[in-house]
C-alpha cells in the first residue's frame, strides 16, 4: 500500500529550528525572519511498526531529497545519521527498523524514540548551532521535545 505522508517542520522546545549542516548532518539554531526559509522540511511518513497505544511509528525523510534520518551503531553507540536511499523504493509502508521512530505526543509536544534503540531519542543541545543527535537520556540537559508545524505540500 502507498504510504501516507505529511510535510512539516520541527522546532525543539527552545524554539530552535533544524537546518542542514553539510550534506549528511542537521544542526539546531534559532532562526528569525527570512532565515526561517533555511529550516529543513520533513516528509513524515506513517509506517508499520509495533502496536502501542501511545507511540506512532513514523519515518522522517527530507522533503524532495532521498535522505532519511536513521539510527545505527557507530563505535558501539546508537547514532543518528542522514542516510541516502533509492527514491524509487522510498518511502514505503514497511520501512527498515533503523528508519523508524516512535512518535510520542503529549499536549502537542513530540518526542521521537528510535525503534531500533528503545529509550534513545532525537535530541538537540542547549547550545546553539550544534548537531542534532541520538541521545540516551530524557529530562536532562539535552532537549528531546519538539513542536511540529505543517507545511503546504
Amino acid at each position: 500500500a502507498p504510504v501516507r505522508s505529511l510535510n512539516c517542520t520541527l522546532r525543539d522546545s527552545q524554539q530552535k529550528s533544524l537546518v542542514m549542516s553539510g550534506p549528511y548532518e542537521l544542526k539546531a539554531l534559532h532562526l528569525q525572519g527570512q532565515d526561517m526559509e533555511q529550516q529543513v522540511v520533513f516528509s513524515m511518513s506513517f509506517v508499520q511498526g509495533e502496536e502501542s497505544n501511545d507511540k506512532i511509528p513514523v519515518a522522517l525523510g527530507l522533503k524532495e531529497k532521498n535522505l532519511y534520518l536513521s539510527c545505527v551503531l557507530k563505535d558501539d553507540k546508537p547514532t543518528l545519521q542522514l542516510e541516502s536511499v533509492d527514491p524509487k523504493n522510498y518511502p514505503k509502508k514497511k520501512m527498515e527498523k533503523r528508519f523508524v521512530f516512535n512518535k510520542i505526543e503529549i499536549n502537542n509536544k513530540l518526542e521521537f524514540e528510535s525503534a531500533q534503540f528503545p529509550n534513545w531519542y532525537i535530541s538537540t543541545s542547549q547550545a546553539e548551532n550544534m548537531p542534532v543527535f541520538l541521545g540516551g537520556t530524557k529530562g536532562g540537559q539535552d532537549i528531546t521535545d519538539f513542536t511540529m508545524q505543517f507545511v503546504s505540500s
Epitope: A1, L6, F46, F150, S152, S153
Partner: antibody
Framework: QVQLVQSGAEVKKPGASVKVSCKVS????????IEWVRQAPGKGLEWIGE????????NYNEKFKGKATITADTSTDTAYMELSSLRSEDTAVYYC?????????????WGQGTLVTVSS | DIQMTQSPSSLSASVGDRVTITCKAS??????LSWFQQKPGKAPKSLIY???RLVDGVPSRFSGSASGTDYTLTISSLQPEDFATYYC?????????FGQGTKLEIK
Amino acid sequence: QVQLVQSGAEVKKPGASVKVSCKVSGYTFSRYWIEWVRQAPGKGLEWIGEILPGSGNINYNEKFKGKATITADTSTDTAYMELSSLRSEDTAVYYCSTIYYDYDQGFTYWGQGTLVTVSS
Amino acid sequence: DIQMTQSPSSLSASVGDRVTITCKASQDIDRYLSWFQQKPGKAPKSLIYRVKRLVDGVPSRFSGSASGTDYTLTISSLQPEDFATYYCLQYDEFPYTFGQGTKLEIK
C-alpha cells in the same frame, strides 16, 4: 467538548451546485483531518475525501473527483464541501467527521449530517 | 480499492445475547479498522478504532479483534440500546471503504 455542526438541509435542481459547511469547536482545527462521507437514502456509507486544514493536504476518492471540492477556512475553523453538476443520484445525507493527523484515532467525532435533495 | 465484506447483512438477537459481526478485508490494512454504530436518522457513532481500542465513553461490552484480514466486533451482552446498524471501515488506503453494514434487530 468537541462539536461538528453542519449547515442545514438543501434542495437543489439538477445541474446546480451546493456547498455544505462543517464548523468545528473544541479542538485544534489544524491538527485533525476533516473527512466527508455520504449516505444515500437507505444505503450504506461512502467516503468522499479529506482535508488537513492549514497543510494543503487533500485526498479524494477518485469516484468523487470533479464532483466534490473540499476546502477549509482556518480563520473560522470551518470546512466546506462543494458538490457540482448535481444529479438525482447525489441525493444523500452528507456527514463530516474528524481523524487525528497521524490517523491513529479513527473517525471519532461526527457532524449531525446535511441532507441534500436533488429534484426538478 | 480495498473491499470490506461484512457479514451477516442482518441479524436477529435478544437482549443478553452475545453477538459477533465480521468484516473481511481484501488485503492487509495494517489494523486501520474502525467500527461504527448508526441508528435511523442519526449520524454514525464511533465505537472502536485500530481494531480493538475502545472510544472514550463506549461500554466495555463492545470489543474488537483481528485474525489475519478478518476483523470481528463482539457485543458480549446485548442491551436494548444496541439494536442498530453496524459498519466497519478500513482507513489504511485510499479510498477508505466501509463494509455494507449489519442490521441488528430484536428477535
